[in-house]
Every structure is written in structure tokens, then in C-alpha cells.
């Protein structure tokens, strides 16, 4: 920020490092909850046409895949990894890829991933080989 920019009162919008550099925000797919045809695949595209600038620079991309007796949905959003999402911690927020991990939710199959490269929640990965052997 140039010297003439006033100091931020609400620092949520401006993440800075020790040298005073400002973090560029993440670009994420952001369609909230949509019906999905993604099922029994190693990976899926989100089919979300909206790429949003995350509101706060500390936010990362998140995808949530849910299946119950009636339908399958895929949720794509930005979220602050310091805060739980759907009651779960975003433990993989620093990953460049969105590698789905199953979470325990009664009455449904629930997978969630988070990642921190541009539009990384567009390609959601279920395949175990990424979880274990892929260094990316």
C-alpha cells in the first residue's frame, strides 16, 4: 500500500507480513451449494462458472461434496482456515490441490477439501493415490 493510504481499522481485509507486504487474495470457485452429478469418480470438475475474489486475503478455497438418499451436492466457497467450516477444521488449507477427505456426518456421505492456489476447488480429487503418494 502506498504511504498515503490510511492505516486499516478493520484489519480483516488486509493481511500483512513482517515487512508490511500485502497479501493478494485467493481466487476461488464460489457457487455455494449446487446439485452435482459427480459420483464414483477419481476426480470431478465443479461445473461452477463463477470465480470469485475471496473477501479476505487469508481465505482459501473450499469444496464440500455431500451424498444422501435423495441427491448429491457440491458446495464451492471461500473460507478462513482459522475458522471451522461445517464444524470441521480446514487442516489441508495450505495444499495446492483440493484432495477430498471423508468426514463423519450422520445420514449422509460427506467429503471436504480446502486448498490455496487459484481456482483449486474447481478440480476436486477423491483418488487415494493423491492422498498418499503424490508429492504435489
Amino acid at each position: 500500500i502506498p504511504p498515503h493510504v490510511q492505516k486499516s481499522v478493520n484489519n480483516d481485509m488486509m493481511v500483512t507480513d513482517n515487512n508490511g507486504a500485502v497479501k493478494f487474495p485467493q481466487l476461488c470457485k464460489f457457487c455455494d451449494v449446487r446439485f452435482s452429478t459427480c459420483d464414483n469418480q477419481k476426480s470431478c470438475l465443479s461445473n461452477c462458472s463463477i470465480t470469485s475474489i475471496c473477501e479476505k486475503p487469508q481465505e482459501v478455497c473450499v469444496a464440500v461434496w455431500r451424498k444422501n438418499d435423495e441427491n448429491i451436492t457440491l458446495e464451492t466457497v471461500c473460507h478462513d482456515p482459522k475458522l471451522p467450516y461445517h464444524d470441521f477444521i480446514l487442516e489441508d488449507a495450505a495444499s495446492p490441490k483440493c484432495i477430498m477427505k471423508e468426514k463423519k456426518k450422520p445420514g449422509e456421505t460427506f467429503f471436504m477439501c480446502s486448498c490455496s492456489s487459484d481456482e483449486c476447488n474447481d478440480n476436486i480429487i477423491f483418488s487415494e493415490e493423491y492422498n498418499t503418494s503424490n508429492p504435489d
Epitope: 500500500i1 502506498p2 504511504p3 500483512t16 507480513d17 515487512n19 508490511g20 507486504a21 500485502v22 497479501k23 493478494f24 481466487l27 475474489i53
Partner: nanobody, 124 residues
């Protein structure tokens, strides 16, 4: 290196329109993703819109999507922001900023990254 200079701000009534420009001097404009960033009085930075150097793919904050349109003319080294249906909450100083490929941070006091800003006031 690229130096940035914004213009086009002013006073406008709610529902009105403005077009901001950001003129870049220097030969490397086409290497950068360009941003419009705003700061309302007493608030933090809000990253409003961005555009890629090649292909001109665009991105918007949810707060301005459908009202603001970012564009660039690489032959004129100029970035634009067309702002329609303006609201009181759009009142802010608007800055343009540049981002090199893969760059995660912008140096805070480096005017090579930021323009001086142009004030937009939306009021009746």
C-alpha cells in the same frame, strides 16, 4: 518497471455510473494481472476486481459482481473499471495494483505496485 496513475473519480448520485482509468507507464504492463482495490474511510482494503494480461479473463468480488466491469487495453497500457448502479457503500479511494505471475504479496510501501488512488463518492 510499471508506474500507475488512476483517474476518473468524483461525486456521483446513488444509481449513477463512473468509469475509472489507470494509466501504466512502462513496457511491461502486459506481464501483469491487474487489480482494482478500494479503501473506504476507516476501513481495510477490499479487492474489487482483477483481469488477466492474456485472454483478459476477469474476476470480481461478490459485492460488485454484475455492477462493475473491469477491462484493459494493452495497446494503450490502460486499465479500466466501469462502475454502474453505484451505492453509498461504494464510496472509497480506488487504487489499481499489479500482480506478477505467481506473486503472493505486494510490497506495502512500493509505489511501483500501487497507484496514488482516485476518490469515488456516492451521495445524494
Amino acid at each position: 518497471e510499471v508506474q500507475l496513475l488512476e483517474s476518473g473519480g468524483g461525486l456521483v448520485q446513488p444509481g449513477g455510473s463512473l468509469r475509472l482509468s489507470c494509466a501504466a507507464s512502462g513496457s511491461t504492463f502486459t506481464e501483469y494481472r491487474m487489480w482494482w482495490v478500494r479503501q473506504a474511510p476507516g476501513k481495510g482494503l477490499e479487492w474489487v476486481s482483477a483481469i488477466e494480461p492474456i485472454g483478459h479473463r476477469t474476476y470480481y468480488a461478490n459485492s460488485v459482481r454484475g455492477r462493475f466491469t473491469i477491462s484493459r487495453d494493452n495497446s494503450k497500457n490502460t486499465l479500466y473499471l466501469q462502475m454502474n448502479s453505484l451505492r453509498a457503500e461504494d464510496t472509497a479511494v480506488y487504487y489499481c495494483a499489479k500482480q506478477a505471475p505467481g506473486e503472493k504479496w505486494a510490497r506495502r510501501w512500493d509505489l511501483d505496485y500501487w497507484g496514488q488512488g482516485t476518490l469515488v463518492t456516492v451521495s445524494s
